[in-house]
Amino acid sequence: IVLRPSRVHNSEENTMRALTLKDILNGTFSYKTFFPNWISGQEYLHQSADNNIVLYNIETGQSYTILSNRTMKSVNASNYGLSPDRQFVYLESDYSKLWRYSYTATYYIYDLSNGEFVRGNELPRPIQYLCWSPVGSKLAYVYQNNIYLKQRPGDPPFQITFNGRENKIFNGIPDWVYEEEMLATKYALWWSPNGKFLAYAEFNDTDIPVIAYSYYGDEQYPRTINIPYPKAGAKNPVVRIFIIDTTYPAYVGPQEVPVPAMIASSDYYFSWLTWVTDERVCLQWLKRVQNVSVLSICDFREDWQTWDCPKTQEHIEESRTGWAGGFFVSTPVFSYDAISYYKIFSDKDGYKHIHYIKDTVENAIQITSGKWEAINIFRVTQDSLFYSSNEFEEYPGRRNIYRISIGSYPPSKKCVTCHLRKERCQYYTASFSDYAKYYALVCYGPGIPISTLHDGRTDQEIKILEENKELENALKNIQLPKEEIKKLEVDEITLWYKMILPPQFDRSKKYPLLIQVYGGPCSQSVRSVFAVNWISYLASKEGMVIALVDGRGTAFQGDKLLYAVYRKLGVYEVEDQITAVRKFIEMGFIDEKRIAIWGWSYGGYVSSLALASGTGLFKCGIAVAPVSSWEYYASVYTERFMGLPTKDDNLEHYKNSTVMARAEYFRNVDYLLIHGTADDNVHFQNSAQIAKALVNAQVDFQAMWYSDQNHGLSGLSTNHLYTHMTHFLKQCFSLSD
């Protein structure tokens, strides 16, 4: 299936040019998406090209500027947030990144009624997190690991927590491991629907071992970065959930929400919090051995001023074949009765599907079914449920949006997106207004991305929000590579792959092959999305064939494939890449003397193991910021898939699956090892240990470090990195510069 054909014809061949590395590094062919900032059923905010904040009313067709670019510029604001009562706007400036999601910033409150900034009782700086209440204009914020509440923006703050301490106690914000591996947010506080209560997590990292690394900076002495970071088997953070009444927070004080007894009996995690009503909250907990999850629905008891979580409202989700959930345990979407909910989990056939839970999980009603997976529930209204899946035409790497009518019986299903722009759009996400009155569809490909606005009742397209016309025009004279998504059937395993082919691809010729791999559990690389990136350049200009393969352990194709890697990371992911390469060679257009593999992070681990597999298939390869031993990586992530590194659990495989154990096997390949020295995620330690093992084995290799760079290798390092890797590959493939 050719998804993105090259527009090359003989008549225009002389005007067409290949992609250059410079194009990629400059982001010349990047695309835009449009996500409305919904503020009601029919209104949204959007930051215009000239940085005005504009309010759009879909029904009247009117728009007006609520905040001028002049006001934004006066405090160098890069972000904003309108209070639900529309009286105030917070303006965010001095953005300072911390980890993947977290950052600090300075906040100013602008009063829309008088056109002035709120003076007196200004917010402290820098703030770690700030948000409006869902109703009115109360503010909750986190400063120096403590939570504060303002009843009104001009009021003095009330301090809710007092024990916050850097790297020790975190209130309302996650510590490193919860941010990266559990919550995937910068915040750990949640307002109830009408703002009566504020729930928050407290993370106690007092006993967690600390990772320390040098940050070289410009000073005479480097400074040391210390992060409480639990590696596999280490002591974990202790989490507690509290709820405070925000009307009179100084009266009762924070109330702790009890942990289900079956969870509290051993090490556990808190995984998410979902408010149902102002007086009902749903908490999800997970055992440290992550195959048991408990969803607990708790009710506020006015007479006792406590949160009661009866055992009858505990719902257990257990996996007998792997870990609970996909990457994360799914979150519930509650229905209007405020007790029953919809949730995605594995059905009896091992496919993740939507289930409706009214009383017990055992009596759950399955809403979707088939040999495909439901991926996300976007919205439940009184008569419809909107979700995404990869059902359409049996392509796991697609995403379409569906509507199920839950108001009628039997429920009817309609694909909202399948036939909208079939060639251009096969991978969608959606954003819904209140009550799903309207929604935006964002199509990511395989064609040029497009964002559209739709009527939530009729699904009719109202207008195009962003169609990337400039990008389309810019690409008209570019020789883009061809892309195809197909599958290999090998020993009862389906291996989907994406192949990126040079513009004038000729099956009768031989091409160098580069495998790009990630391969981490519950990941997916073979997706029908648009991208003009480094590998596009390698195919377009350098004539390489690039392939991405989703092997065992990857997502959205059922539990058999997903959980195949459970407790044995580093085995089947590598085997499946090798199997695919052998199949590609059989296709006849691959030069088997010029095959390389590269990957980043988990992909760096897989590429390293593939290079050291002793197959002789790979001439060379690159590992960027690889994991080298699972004992070095975060507990929450690692133990989910590997269990504990203890003798009575899975220590043996922890030891067997290291890159270092295979040092000897790198002798016959060209290996480029790359890592940032300030990588807070996959620590430089990983590459340091690979390098040490290779030196000890007297194996030659190439290496590059990026001083003071984290796991993303951003900024100028990106340019240097891709230039360096390009030289390495061209040299490996004997391509002239």
């Epitope: 009782n121 301090q159 927070p249 100084a250 009266y251 009762v252 004080g253 924070p254």
Partner: antibody, heavy 117, light 108 residues
Framework: EVQLLESGGGLVQPGGSLRLSCAAS????????MSWVRQAPGKGLEWVSA????????YYADSVKGRFTISRDNSKNTLYLQMNSLRAEDTAVYYC??????????WGQGTLVTVSS | EIVLTQSPGTLSLSPGERATLSCRAS???????LAWYQQKPGQAPRLLIY???SRATGIPDRFSGSGSGTDFTLTISRLEPEDFAVYYC?????????FGQGTKVEIK
């Protein structure tokens, strides 16, 4: 009906110790933060200390920090104030009150602590 | 810490008269955290008003509270004989919670 009953007051020498108790009834004791407030003879009210419902968090006025310890036994519905290194200026009627920082909606009748040699 | 200054120190009024008690804070206090108490000789304080203007359970409607920021007022619309006592304002916006020095309402 909410009731708070303090006990344990008395005469003590400077440097001495005393432990005050406050027996609570008529409400779910473990749910509420509780405080101690004192009143020196003929003077106004002064907040001394507070404790969260679970007992996990405690708060003190600077004047008593390091000398006084607030605690609670939720199984006995009782609040305590352990007072060490007592000084003459600690002489006061000590009230236990229901509430964290404000409002204090119920108060005990108070117990008199006299620090004198 | 926030210092609360009450005025007047003593208010001499007759039953049936209107009493206006003032409480001024050294720095801004959110009205949610301002309370008024009544204390009679030999008795424990009693909560009258919380959240600057909400009457506590069982408090007659002749007692009312108002104000915001740094200036708060307790008003007794018509003094009854049992209202002659000492009145304290209190803030819990900032640790430590603090009380005013009190206003004594005495019979003229």
């Amino acid at each position: 009906e909410v009731q708070l009953l303090e006990s344990g007051g008395g005469l003590v020498q400077p440097g001495g110790s005393l432990r005050l108790s406050c027996a609570a009834s008529g409400f779910t004791f473990s749910s509420y933060a509780m405080s101690w407030v004192r009143q020196a003879p003929g003077k106004g009210l002064e907040w001394v200390s507070a404790i969260s419902g679970s007992g996990g968090s405690t708060y003190y006025a600077d004047s008593v920090k390091g000398r006084f310890t607030i605690s609670r036994d939720n199984s006995k519905n009782t609040l305590y104030l352990q007072m060490n290194s007592l000084r003459a200026e600690d002489t006061a009627v000590y009230y236990c009150a229901k509430g964290w920082f404000t409002p204090f909606d119920y108060w005990g009748q108070g117990t008199l602590v006299t620090v004198s040699s | 810490e926030i210092v609360l200054t009450q005025s007047p120190g003593t208010l001499s009024l007759s039953p049936g008269e209107r009493a206006t008690l003032s409480c001024r804070a050294s720095q801004s206090v959110s009205s949610s955290y301002l309370a008024w108490y009544q204390q009679k000789p030999g008795q424990a304080p009693r909560l009258l008003i919380y959240g600057a203007s909400s009457r506590a359970t069982g408090i007659p409607d002749r007692f009312s509270g108002s104000g915001s920021g740094t200036d708060f007022t307790l008003t007794i619309s018509r003094l009854e004989p049992e209202d002659f006592a000492v009145y304290y304002c209190q803030q819990g916006n900032q640790i430590p919670p603090t009380f005013g020095q009190g206003t004594k309402v005495e019979i003229k």
